[in-house]
């Protein structure tokens, strides 16, 4: 025997209080598949969330984050504060990367400059808070009289963090 509710299309629900008549979803609710016994409450995009797509009777609202925040999680379920490049987010707010570390993103944490000497190379371009160092040829490869820039970059061996 066919379930009488299966004929209720998306945007409606099978109303048990009215002899399983297909009733439209009430305001601020939706059903995205047929045969639903109830409509789901629409997601509210509040606070740091803003509406990317409004809720309709057949599909949920979609949110993203207000400017200055970025999405995390499925369907942008979380918003985390942005920082500038060269900074990382702490509980006390955005803090500049410590000397010898950098962050080239608006999110995430600072990480140490590459230690060129571990690969037998020299520093071609100094690192900054926003950019890693650029490693060049090994000092032995440099022509006589040429000098290489060697800032005091922290060790970047696997498993070591800047202290």
């Amino acid at each position: 025997l066919q379930d009488p509710c299966s004929k209720c299309p998306a945007g409606t629900f099978c109303d048990n209080n009215r002899n399983q008549i297909c009733s439209p979803c009430p305001p601020n609710s939706f059903s995205s598949t047929s045969g639903q016994k109830a409509c789901d409450i629409c997601r509210q995009c509040e606070g740091v969330f803003r509406t990317k797509k409004v809720c309709s009777s057949t599909s949920n609202a979609e949110c993203d984050c207000t400017p200055g925040f970025h999405c995390l999680g499925a369907g942008c379920s979380m918003c985390e504060q942005d920082c500038k490049q060269g900074q990382e987010l702490t509980k006390k707010g955005c803090k500049d990367c410590c000397f010898g570390t950098f962050n080239d993103q608006k999110r995430g944490i600072c990480r140490p400059w590459t230690n060129c000497s571990l690969d037998g190379k020299s520093v071609l371009v100094n690192g900054t808070k926003e950019r890693d160092v650029v490693c060049g040829p090994s000092p032995a490869d440099l022509s006589p009289g040429a000098s290489s820039v060697t800032p005091p970059a922290p060790a970047r061996e696997p498993g070591h963090s800047p202290q």
Partner: antibody, heavy 116, light 109 residues
Framework: QVQLVQSGAEVKKPGESLKISCKGS????????ISWVRQMPGKGLEWMGK????????NYSPSFQGQVTISADKSISTAYLQWSSLKASDTAMYYC?????????WGQGTLVTVSS | DIELTQPPSVSVAPGQTARISCSGD??????AHWYQQKPGQAPVVVIY???NRPSGIPERFSGSNSGNTATLTISGTQAEDEADYYC???????????FGGGTKLTVLG
Amino acid sequence: QVQLVQSGAEVKKPGESLKISCKGSGYSFSTYWISWVRQMPGKGLEWMGKIYPGDSYTNYSPSFQGQVTISADKSISTAYLQWSSLKASDTAMYYCARGYGIFDYWGQGTLVTVSS
Amino acid sequence: DIELTQPPSVSVAPGQTARISCSGDNIGDQYAHWYQQKPGQAPVVVIYQDKNRPSGIPERFSGSNSGNTATLTISGTQAEDEADYYCSTYTFVGFTTVFGGGTKLTVLG
């Protein structure tokens, strides 16, 4: 949509080596940290370490430093966790997760069983 | 590194309030996050950055964090809330993440 898909369950003998994987899709794999988390049978979550796939910078929990190696190949959006010599005490579920503080996406877990 | 201590188990009657504590030296100086894990499943964030609730997580979940204790509160606990709960924090001292030992929440009845 964002997904982290881990390699399948492994059964190994003590002393053997192993490398398990975590493939990311649906986002810019290179620019998000990947962490590895251990859960021994009936026990809690333990953070093992993390990697930034963009440049393969790694950072380990003191408890796991020297015990495992975390690596990544950004060209195939995959992070790895490896052991050179497994012990029976390495028997656990291993999860990869996106992030360093807030872990917003998790792999399904890889069960590693080490038994003679 | 900071150590986070949670009670191994908490029991609550349906409809009552469950509180799970997470204590650690000056944890209030860091963000605390809370994860729910049900048997055979990966953990899921229920509270992030001390008190923020991801969309899709019921309003009965809330969090606070100050001094040496972070707390996860579940008001009007339901049977489906029965799970293991873990607190965690990221510390800028060792650049590491630490999890609490976990708390098994049992909903009685």
